[in-house]
């Protein structure tokens, strides 16, 4: 055992020499990004003050490309890297095209609607006078690859102009434009040449040791990993943690079970109950409020304000108000709640899919007229999984190097 | 060419109310906003408030809240001004003005209407 | 007495250039971009001529200019011809109203 505990030190750390180097640089592992959309059924009935009913259509599926670029060894035991992703659309597993329309909540017209709320009528008043002259409504109908990789539309100039540096879009806004051949921000992490016990953890992320998007300290810190490989020799007590960029705060995985996964060892991770819930059902998240119902995350300070919300897909796990406010969601364990499957001994996920959603807070705001008699209501845009799986020669190294060669070298 | 045509000169009692309309044509009446600004005799101008028709949002400077009432009708294009409790004070020309966007920016008090002269005298 | 602060009167030759302060304060023209300016002939009705503080309406002579320094606007127009007689006024808008100037008397010698 302290020779394969030997070759797997020797062979995990972010060394170019090592066996799993290219492996941490240039992910093997395809991965899938499947996208449902909840297609709005009743817009004008909303705008009269009906309950939403949506209908999920998808999944439109991409293939993630990922690539870490700008690699630089630092002299304290740490790898700078930027990480690059890229998306493909696949047609054969998606069901649907690029080119299908969803009527959609428009997000800029109704995410500015709940941000001026509070603001002097006269302001609002030029507000809905903006949205009726260039055509804004308070619900859209766009297709697949508009609301993912951005439509034009001229209300992005518009905040551009009164709201300068408030918003990250420059003449289209999308979705997921953001993240599609760009980087999720400057990533320093821990090599674990000089100390194995640091190994992926982040030091770093775009030169910040937390961030300020919270309002305590305990949200605000940067903790785990990349959100990629783990610390080896994992137990059932130990945690999955990682900072999402993304969702702009560290999350916590915990152990439920051990299992095999193409005759690789592994343990499970899953999301607790809490990491949604809201800060009166478990205090730590205080610091993520103001908080609607629980097991929703008001991600709005660090989402150019609009009121957004991620939470697991179909409100799993959440308030069950959220769920009966909208007809069309079917909140199901097997189907909505994410998970890791992690090979303890490396640290290295063999199969994941993470899953979340995202979702608006809409209603009717006085001045906007646009909002019509909307009731409040946190009503889902979209979820997603994020999913890969190791294969091919890959997993097959990796089943020779990890599983095949110590059980020969033990006999 | 967009022209505001107002209603013709009043003279009313103190105490009494008087009602300004403003008639929109040449443009998409509900495209627009519509405000209405005074003008005491040999003073500066004063906003009272304004509407937009398509959603029958209105807003009231608060020197005026609760005397002045701010109406449309997309069915004839106008707006219309009611000012109650008239006092001498109020004696002013009225105007009407459109307020517009454009994805160049806000025209606040775009094109104005001739006025309407409203004497409040016993 | 007015929100904006202007002068009373100012007056130029043909040819010349004048230009025309509107003192606010922070709250209204230093707070906001939505700094205008109209030009009302005696007996007319008011026209606006600069928008958003520098912005031109379609129609409206390139002699005339708008700026904004910290919570003072001007209006500034060059070439000075006899139709440019008239009262001018700024307005801002100012924590949910419309505030104008006193308005200024330009007299063109």
């Known amino acids: 055992p302290s020779l394969i505990k030997q070759q797997v030190l020797k062979n995990v750390r972010i060394d170019p020499s090592s066996l799993s180097f290219n492996m941490w640089k240039e992910i093997p592992i395809p991965f899938y990004l499947s996208v449902y959309f909840f297609d709005v059924m009743n817009p004008s009935e909303i705008l009269k003050g009906e309950k939403p009913q949506v209908r999920e259509r998808g999944p439109y599926v991409y293939r993630e490309f990922r690539h870490k670029s700008n690699i630089t060894f630092n002299n304290n035991d740490t790898v700078s890297f930027l990480e690059y992703r890229t998306f493909q659309f696949q047609p054969s597993k998606s069901h649907g095209s690029e080119s299908d329309y969803i009527v959609m909540p428009n997000i800029l017209v109704l995410g500015a609607a709940v941000m001026m709320e509070n603001k002097p009528m006269t302001l609002k008043l030029i507000m809905t006078l903006a949205f009726t002259t260039l055509g804004e409504r308070a619900f859209m109908n766009r297709t697949v690859g508009e609301i993912m990789w951005g439509y034009k539309d001229p209300l992005v100039n518009l905040i551009n102009k009164y709201f300068p540096g408030m918003f990250p879009f420059k003449d289209k806004f999308g979705l997921f434009a953001e993240l599609n051949n760009s980087d999720s921000g400057l990533f320093t992490v821990f090599t674990g040449v000089q100390n194995i016990s640091r190994i992926h953890l982040v030091d770093k992320w775009n030169g910040l040791s937390k961030v300020d998007f919270w309002h305590s300290d305990q949200c605000n810190m940067i903790n785990g990993t990349s959100g990629q490989m783990w610390p080896p020799f994992m137990t059932p007590e130990s945690s999955l943690e990682f900072y999402s960029p993304e969702a702009c705060r560290s999350m916590k995985l915990m152990y439920k079970e051990s299992g095999v996964f193409e005759g690789i060892p592994t343990y499970r991770f899953v999301a607790p109950k809490t990491l949604f819930a809201n800060g009166s059902i478990y205090p730590p998240n205080e610091g993520f409020c103001p908080c609607l119902e629980s097991g929703i995350q008001n991600v709005s300070t660090c989402r150019f304000s609009a009121p957004l919300f991620l939470s697991h897909p179909h409100f799993l796990n959440a308030d069950p108000v959220l769920a009966e406010a909208v007809t069309g969601l079917h909140p199901n364990q097997e189907a909505h709640s994410l998970f890791l499957d992690i090979h303890p001994v490396t640290g290295i996920p063999m199969n994941c899919s993470v899953k979340l959603q995202l979702s608006l807070y809409m209603k009717s705001v006085a001045g906007i007229g646009q909002t019509g008699k909307i009731e409040p209501v946190v009503l889902p845009l979209l979820w997603f999984a994020e999913s890969g799986a190791m294969e091919g020669e890959t997993l097959h190294t990796f089943y020779t190097q990890l599983v095949l060669m110590p059980k020969v070298m033990h006999y | 060419q967009v022209q505001l045509v107002q209603s013709g000169a009043e003279v009313k009692k103190p105490g009494s109310s008087v009602k300004v309309s403003c008639k929109a044509s040449g443009g998409t009446f509900s495209d627009y906003g519509f405000s209405w600004v005074r003008q005491a005799p040999g003073q500066g101008l004063e906003w009272m408030g304004g509407?937009?028709?398509?959603?029958?949002?209105?807003n009231y400077a608060q020197k005026f809240q609760g005397r002045v009432t701010i109406t449309a009708d997309e069915s004839t294009s106008t707006a219309y001004m009611e000012l109650s409790s008239l006092r001498s004070e109020d004696t002013a020309v009225y105007y009407c003005?459109?307020?517009?966007?454009?994805?160049?920016?806000?025209?606040?008090?775009?094109?104005w209407g001739q006025g309407t002269l409203v004497t409040v005298s016993s | 007495q007015s929100a904006l602060t202007q002068p009373a009167s100012v007056s130029g030759s043909p040819g010349q250039s004048i230009t025309i302060s509107c003192t606010g304060t922070s709250s209204d023209v230093g707070a906001f971009n939505f700094v205008y300016w109209y030009q009302q002939h005696p007996g007319k009705a008011p026209k606006l001529m600069i928008y958003?503080?520098?912005n031109r309406p379609s129609g409206v002579s390139n002699r005339f200019s708008g700026s904004k320094s910290g919570n003072t606007a001007s209006l500034t127009i060059s070439g000075l011809q006899a139709e440019d007689e008239a009262d001018y006024y700024c307005?801002?808008?100012?924590?949910?109203?419309?505030?104008f100037g006193g308005g200024t008397k330009l007299t063109v010698l």
């Open positions: 509407i937009i028709p398509i959603f029958d949002t209105t």
């Open positions: 307005s801002s808008y100012a924590d949910n109203n419309w505030v």
């Open positions: 958003e503080v520098s």
């Open positions: 003005a459109r307020d517009f966007f454009d994805s160049a920016g806000y025209y606040a008090f775009e094109i």
